[in-house]
Interface confidence: low
């Protein structure tokens, strides 16, 4: 059971394969290690985040670097490579029967894709099987120009979906974060990510767990019992990867779910957020869009306390100051609500014991026709040591049968300017989100009317 | 603005080639892909083939593979189609067009009348 | 290869009228469906690109729609600088196909 050798970098030749679904050939595979480091790296790390339209924040608050401006930067860099693990593909607006303005954001960058293609460079897409997408053309157009599409079946292998949302560009650069490749991401929804420049050792961990899917998207595979020794990781938990990022001591790794897809070395999603959680002394500071302390896709569902305990054990035993804040839209399911309830009756300042939950309602104002948009879709987490960002929802499916990754992020403080760390820069866009007026108390929602914005 | 300049008209004999030349200007030429589009007197359109003078890629519509060839010269944005082994059949209009968003061919050349006598 | 069909090869219609041309893929084009504008002197213009986009410059009395295999360019008020052949252009599957063309003449 081997990985089949592929194509020498750059070598595929754009439309220049059947017109169906690429399934047989494989994405060039990474430069060797020593060839990556002949380039030495320099590691770069940018936050970047979508705001839906006509959301406006208060002027200079903080921001993060714009998604699709940081999308469009990330594919200009490519020479030779760019693979996309992703949920779906929906980034022209008539895929959904919507004729709106702001998915031009989208056609421009399914636009910059195409043009990629004619420039010799080899696109790489493992994408979910099942998917939302059923109407989106978005690969095939790809695949008629020459980008290899392979549609990963985890709702057969592990009764999941393919979750992720991540790109490696020339083994060299990384995007991970919340958002999907749809128009949507980019000007309707609230996303947030990490773009990653110059740093061949982190990118070539995660193009690892790309390969992993890459292998389960040909006919009839199956999930090995044990992965084969190429996908495993030399970064995890216990051994970050240490560099300097803009000159800024770091240490990095990246996180995998389920455990079926996590090789030897690979830290599992749920420990790797259980350590930051764990290792928190001051604050825990999360944005989800779901939360849920069960099961979300199996019948009957099962309680599955394992995030809601960590969080309620860090606040009552540690005095770690505990903030949620938990998207809300016309698409949420209400049933989360006690549960939201439940965790914040922990609260008892007198007692040194601080849980706050707080929704963020993204008004739907003139945008109605759209649909599965105006929401708070990020899936990150701060703390004063570590920032992570990740692509999963926070109930158990999520890290037991659907595929995602996590980044966990820790800078020194101290070497440089004040505010300048990860934590840091997510932290301030964590408490610019709580303390907007778009942050909703659950004392302020009336059941029946959780998500609609009161204006 | 986007101009793409084309001659207005080549008279050839049966038998031999003709490269006709589309320069462009009033963007990046090497960022989109050129089109070549043929129409017979008194009739449709009909594509065929493109190139990426980012990096000389192409296709082609089947039917034009062994006639048409398609070349760019970066230095002078200048798209090139020779055709070969001319018959009555290729006396036509052929047309130059750059491949804008989603493929649409969003600026065309005038086109260079092909006249094949002897 | 994807047949495009335009089945009315000319249409007369007076300045002022609402005017539709149709257009027929052999299969689903989803929408990557493009409509030109080519004059009597042989000048040729893009004017709606991806079923419904107007392409810069051109004038909002155009309009297209459809879906699946089935599509339309709507003229809302026929001017006289209309008078031109359309084309319709499918950009799903290589190669690229073009409909035979509706010419549009004033009554």
């Known amino acids: 059971w081997q990985v089949p050798r592929p194509p020498t970098w750059g070598q595929v030749q754009p439309k220049d394969v059947p017109r169906s679904w690429e399934h047989g050939s494989s994405p060039a595979w990474e430069p060797l290690e020593a060839e990556a480091r002949q380039q030495r790296d320099s590691c770069q790390l940018v936050l970047v985040e979508s705001i839906p339209q006509d959301l406006p924040s208060a002027a200079g608050s903080p921001s993060a670097q714009p998604l699709g401006q940081a999308w469009l930067q990330l594919l200009d860099t490519a020479q030779e490579s760019v693979h996309v693990a992703s949920y779906y593909w929906s980034l022209t607006g008539p895929d959904i029967g919507v004729n709106d303005s702001s998915s031009q954001l989208g056609e421009a960058l399914l636009q910059k894709l195409q043009q990629l293609l004619g420039r010799n460079i080899s696109l790489a897409v493992a994408t979910s099987s099942p998917t939302l997408a059923r109407t989106s053309t978005d690969l095939q157009v790809l695949a008629a120009r020459g980008a290899h599409v392979r549609q990963v079946p985890m709702g057969r292998l592990t009764r999941g979906v393919l979750h992720s949302k991540f790109w490696v560009v020339d083994g060299r650069h990384i995007y991970m974060g919340s958002a999907n490749m749809d128009w949507r991401s980019l000007t309707q929804v609230k996303e947030l990510g990490a773009v990653i420049y110059n740093c061949s050792h982190l990118a070539q961990d995660l193009e690892k767990t790309f390969q992993t899917y890459w292998v389960l998207g040909v006919p009839k595979a199956v999930l090995p019992k044990t992965w084969p020794q190429n996908f495993s990781s030399h970064f995890n938990r216990f051994q970050p990867f240490h560099g300097l990022f803009d000159g800024v001591p770091t240490t990095a790794y990246f996180s995998a779910s389920p455990p079926a897809l996590c090789p030897q070395g690979r830290t599992r999603d749920l420990e790797a957020l259980l350590a930051v959680m764990g290792s928190a002394q001051e604050f825990i500071y999360a944005s989800v869009m779901e939360y849920f302390p069960t099961t979300r896709f199996s019948h009957p569902p099962r309680y599955w306390p394992v995030l809601d305990n960590a969080l309620r054990a860090a606040a009552f035993g540690k005095g770690v100051r505990v903030r949620l804040l938990v998207g809300c839209g016309l698409n949420t399911d209400p049933t989360m609500f006690p549960y939201l309830r439940s965790l914040q009756a922990l609260s008892n300042p007198a007692a040194n014991v601080s849980v706050d939950v707080k929704v963020f309602i993204v008004p739907v104002g003139n945008h109605s026709n759209i649909p599965f948009s105006r929401v708070n879709h990020s899936k990150f987490m701060v703390t004063e040591k570590a920032a992570y960002i990740g692509t999963s929802n926070w109930s158990e499916d999520y890290f037991s049968s659907t595929a995602g990754v996590g980044l966990v992020v820790t800078q020194s403080p101290g070497a440089q300017p004040a505010g300048a760390t990860v934590q840091e820069q997510l932290r301030q866009l964590f408490e610019r989100d709580w303390s907007s007026r778009y942050a909703v108390g659950l004392d302020g929602q009336a059941p029946g009317q959780d998500c609609v914005w009161q204006g | 603005q986007v101009q793409l300049q084309q001659p207005g008209a080549e008279l050839v004999k049966p038998g031999t080639s003709v490269k006709m030349s589309c320069k462009a200007s009033?963007?990046?030429?090497?960022?989109?892909?050129m089109h070549w589009v043929k129409q017979r007197p008194g009739q449709g359109l009909e594509w065929i083939g493109d190139?990426?003078?980012?990096?000389?890629?192409?296709n082609y519509n089947e039917k034009f593979k062994s006639k048409a060839t398609l070349t760019v010269d970066t230095s002078s944005s200048t798209a090139y189609m020779q055709l070969s082994s001319l018959t009555s059949e290729d006396s036509a209009v052929y047309y130059c067009?750059?491949?804008?968003?989603?493929?649409?061919?969003?600026?065309w050349g005038q086109g260079t009348s092909v006249t094949v006598s002897s | 290869d994807i047949q495009m069909t335009q089945t009315t090869s000319s249409l007369s219609a007076s300045l002022g009228d609402r005017v539709t041309i149709s257009c027929r893929a052999s299969?689903?084009?989803?929408?990557?469906l493009n409509w030109y504008q080519q004059k009597p002197d042989g000048t040729v213009k893009l004017l709606i690109y991806?079923?419904?986009r107007l392409h810069s410059g051109v004038p909002s009395r155009f309009s297209g729609s459809g879906s699946g295999t089935d599509y339309s360019l709507t003229i809302s008020n026929l001017e006289q600088e209309d008078i031109a052949t359309y084309f319709c252009?499918?950009?799903?599957?290589?190669?690229?196909?073009f409909g035979g063309g509706t010419k549009l003449e004033i009554k």
């Open positions: 067009a750059r491949g804008g968003w989603l493929d649409a061919m969003d600026y």
């Open positions: 252009q499918q950009g799903n599957t290589l190669p690229w196909t």
């Open positions: 299969q689903d084009i989803s929408n990557y």
């Open positions: 009033g963007y990046t030429f090497t960022s989109y892909w």
């Open positions: 190139i990426y003078p980012g990096s000389d890629s192409t």
């Open positions: 991806y079923t419904s």
